[in-house]
């Protein structure tokens, strides 16, 4: 049983990273003297409690940052925060902490990330580029919910 | 405003069975998880065990694992204790309990007014 | 199963600061114990008070606080009122199950 968060880094198919900038996620092409952050994640240790097959639930949060990736409605419209919080705080909560998990789901190379909260809402950002990661229900072309997730050990 | 109400005395044989209810209004049931707890007089409080409403996955604690069985209906927002082979040692106060998240903790936050259940023949 | 044991009964006076504890016969009560208080009044009227060891629910009055001292979990009144006059539970949990202390009856005169 992991017990620790693993690392990793994200990026599109259009080869964009994820960048923290003013408290905010963005994706951004990568350029030189660019530092895209690293991810931590953690599988929930709850995951018999979850709804099976729909990926592997985990907290995602910003390695050494204390920033973990959450979902909360702003009027009636789910959206994507970065909220100040320990990841093995999470990880270690009597009960799965729904509004910080994500059911990660891999094919091939693609990862997406759909919220436990809000399900068929999922992690994405703007086909256009620089601007904040959003939570999107519409997996057309206007936004992009596939992403690269490469370990880092 | 955040109500519990749950269902009256039940007064029942040794050996049979008792469904009792909890019935939410001012949320709703999917969007927490629901506990159960029993008291009895000079003992405390037992933790029986939690639905997640969502899914309706239980999980309880050992002692009550075959006596108490959890369920949730969310088109009536309610939530369900069975217990069942039933003898004195059941008879006792059940209460249910919504586990609430906010911001940093889960919280015990709102409770129902209890349904005292007796065994006796 | 664990234990858990608390005091089981204080008196306060209005104004004053009162102390109530939690103790586990597993050893030191820790954060990853998420202690939990809550307050029973008469006719079974529950309120949940502390969750996750120091985090005041929404609505209960900041004279309510949640701390470890020492080996034990710990719910502070400062400043005492009469209405506070009630049962106290703490609740830890052991990674699969919630255990219950068997509460203290607080009694402000």
């Known amino acids: 049983k992991i017990d620790t968060p693993q690392r990793g880094s994200i990026q599109d198919i259009n080869h964009r990273v994820w960048v923290l900038q003013d408290q905010t996620l963005i994706a951004v092409p990568r350029k030189d003297r660019m530092s895209p952050v690293t991810i931590a994640l953690i599988s929930c240790r709850h995951v018999e409690t979850l709804e099976k097959d729909r990926g592997n639930p985990i907290y995602l949060g910003l390695n050494g940052l204390n920033l973990c990736l959450m979902c909360a409605k702003v009027g009636d419209q789910p959206t994507l925060q970065l909220k100040e919080k320990d990841i093995m705080d999470l990880y270690n909560q009597p009960e799965p902490v729904k509004s910080f998990l994500f059911y990660h789901s891999q094919s091939g190379r693609n990862s997406t990330f759909e919220s436990v909260a809000f399900p068929g809402w999922f992690i994405a950002v703007s086909s256009e580029g620089g601007c904040p990661l959003i939570l999107t229900q519409e997996l057309g072309k206007a936004n992009t919910t596939d992403f690269g997730l490469t370990m880092l050990f | 405003e955040v109500q519990l109400q749950q269902s009256g005395a039940e007064l029942v044989k040794p050996g049979a069975s008792v469904k009792l209810s909890c019935t939410v209004s001012?949320?709703?049931?999917?969007?927490?998880?629901m506990y159960w707890v029993k008291q009895r007089p000079e003992q405390g409080l037992e933790w029986i065990g939690r639905i997640d409403p969502a899914n309706g996955y239980a999980k309880y604690d050992p002692k009550f694992q075959g006596k108490a069985t959890l369920t949730a209906d969310t088109s009536s927002n309610t939530a369900y204790l069975q217990l069942s082979s039933l003898t004195s040692e059941d008879t006792a106060v059940y209460f249910c309990?919504?586990?609430?998240?906010?911001?940093?903790?889960?919280?015990?936050?709102?409770w129902g007014q209890g349904t005292t259940l007796t065994v006796s023949s | 199963q664990a234990v858990v044991t608390q005091e089981s009964a204080l008196t306060t006076s209005p104004g004053e600061t009162v102390t109530l504890t939690c103790r586990s016969s597993s050893g030191a009560v820790t954060t990853s114990n998420y202690a939990n208080w809550v307050q029973e009044k008469p006719d079974h009227l529950f309120t949940g008070l502390i969750g996750g060891t120091n985090n005041r629910a929404p609505g209960v009055p900041a004279r309510f606080s949640g701390s470890l001292i020492g080996d034990k979990a710990a719910l502070t009144i400062t400043g005492a009122q009469t209405e506070d006059e009630a049962i106290y539970f703490c609740?830890?949990?052991?990674?699969?199950?919630?255990?219950f202390g068997g509460g203290t009856k607080l009694t402000v005169l």
């Open positions: 309990a919504r586990f609430h998240w906010y911001d940093s903790a889960f919280y015990f936050d709102f």
């Open positions: 001012g949320f709703n049931i999917k969007d927490t998880y």
């Open positions: 609740g830890l949990w052991y990674s699969n199950h919630w255990v």
